[in-house]
């Protein structure tokens, strides 16, 4: 959970389960300009392990739209454009926080949820085992 | 912002700025097992664009620990272990949601914040231009 420091200048909470439930301001402070990942760079096309981006939409979640990467090939693309199947294209995954409406369809009540998303792909050298 | 459906069975909110501020349950529902990214896979070591993971800690943020990827090389690692500088190792970035304590040090009041994190690296083929 979250380690809770105390401060007398803070908003008070009468919730008997505090600090299980907190107030969250939804006016997002954006530390960077938000962009559609397809526009932010063309790495997904120019990588040796290229990927396609799939739109995952869920109105009960915030953010409601998440882009999921799916590697285009099993292997990695060589300089000549052919695929090298002695190498592997694999998804790079990251655990992210989302807000899930709880109870469902409620506008002002959420629960934190961790989900695993594939952000892009990378080319790896597999460890080879020869089975006797 | 968040599109707000209405439902009579939802918790009520007396906040005059509603739905700017919502209640969030911090008992995280985890759709996957949470792991240190170093343990989840060794792609960071075996990729042709390997990366190091740096721990970014901030007690005023949830999650307080975020792992940032830094590409190990400018170029990409070839089969013989040497680096090919005609290719580029580049970070794959993703915008994620975090909770920022607001006011600072307060246990029960947060603001949503979007930050850009580097999750891993991929190897890309640059388009070459010769400058006249």
């Amino acid at each position: 959970g979250i380690a809770i420091p105390r401060n007398s200048g803070c908003p008070n909470s009468e919730d008997k389960n505090f600090p299980r439930t907190v107030m969250v301001n939804l006016n997002i402070h954006n530390r960077n300009t938000s962009t559609n990942p397809k526009r932010s760079s063309d790495y997904y096309n120019r990588s040796t392990s290229p990927w396609n981006l799939h739109r995952n939409e869920d109105p009960e979640r915030y953010p409601s739209v998440i882009w999921e990467a799916k590697c285009r090939h099993l292997g990695c693309v060589k300089a000549d454009g052919n695929v090298d199947y002695h190498m592997n294209s694999v998804p790079i995954q990251q655990e992210i926080l989302v807000l899930r409406r709880e109870p469902r369809h409620c506008p002002n009540s959420f629960r934190l949820e961790k989900i695993l998303v594939s952000v892009g792909c990378t080319c790896v050298t597999p460890i080879v085992h020869h089975v006797a | 912002g968040i599109a707000i459906p209405r439902n009579s069975g939802c918790p009520n909110s007396e906040d005059k700025n509603f739905p700017r501020t919502v209640m969030v349950n911090l008992n995280i529902h985890n759709r996957n097992t949470s792991t240190n990214p170093k343990r989840s896979s060794d792609y960071y070591n075996r990729s042709t664009s390997p990366w190091n993971l740096h721990r970014n800690e901030d007690p005023e943020r949830y999650p307080s620990v975020i792992w940032e990827a830094k590409c190990r090389h400018l170029g990409c690692v070839k089969a013989d272990g040497n680096v090919d500088y005609h290719m580029n190792s580049v970070p794959i970035q993703q915008e994620i949601l975090v909770l920022r304590r607001e006011p600072r040090h307060c246990p029960n009041s947060f603001r949503l914040e979007k930050i850009l994190v580097s999750v891993g690296c991929t190897c890309v083929t640059p388009i070459v231009h010769h400058v006249a």
Epitope: Y43 | K70, L74, N88, V90, V124, I127, V128, V131
Partner: nanobody, 116 residues
Amino acid sequence: EVQLVESGGGSVQAGDSLRLSCAASGRANSINWFGWFRQTPGKEREFVAGIRWSDAYTEYANSVKGRFTISRDNAKNTVDLQMDSLKPEDTAVYYCVLDLSTVRYWGQGTQVTVSS
């Protein structure tokens, strides 16, 4: 359009020093890394040194490690290559490279000649 202006090449004796400079102008934003390659007749261009823009991480070819030092000036979009203890085998055309991750710009090159 991106422009690269290289300077500082010339002829020196073995053991001497030279400083190469490269200045980028035009739409040189979102720099990934900036650096130098070199080429001798009949051979492929080889990487010499590079500096990553985001964190000033530097990388060198084994052949120049400990002798060459790359540095940058963020404000001016310039990169310098200080070449010390030069050897005859450092003789080559040195090319400035500006890398924007998926697009790479090569300068016209500057000749460095090291005689014994």
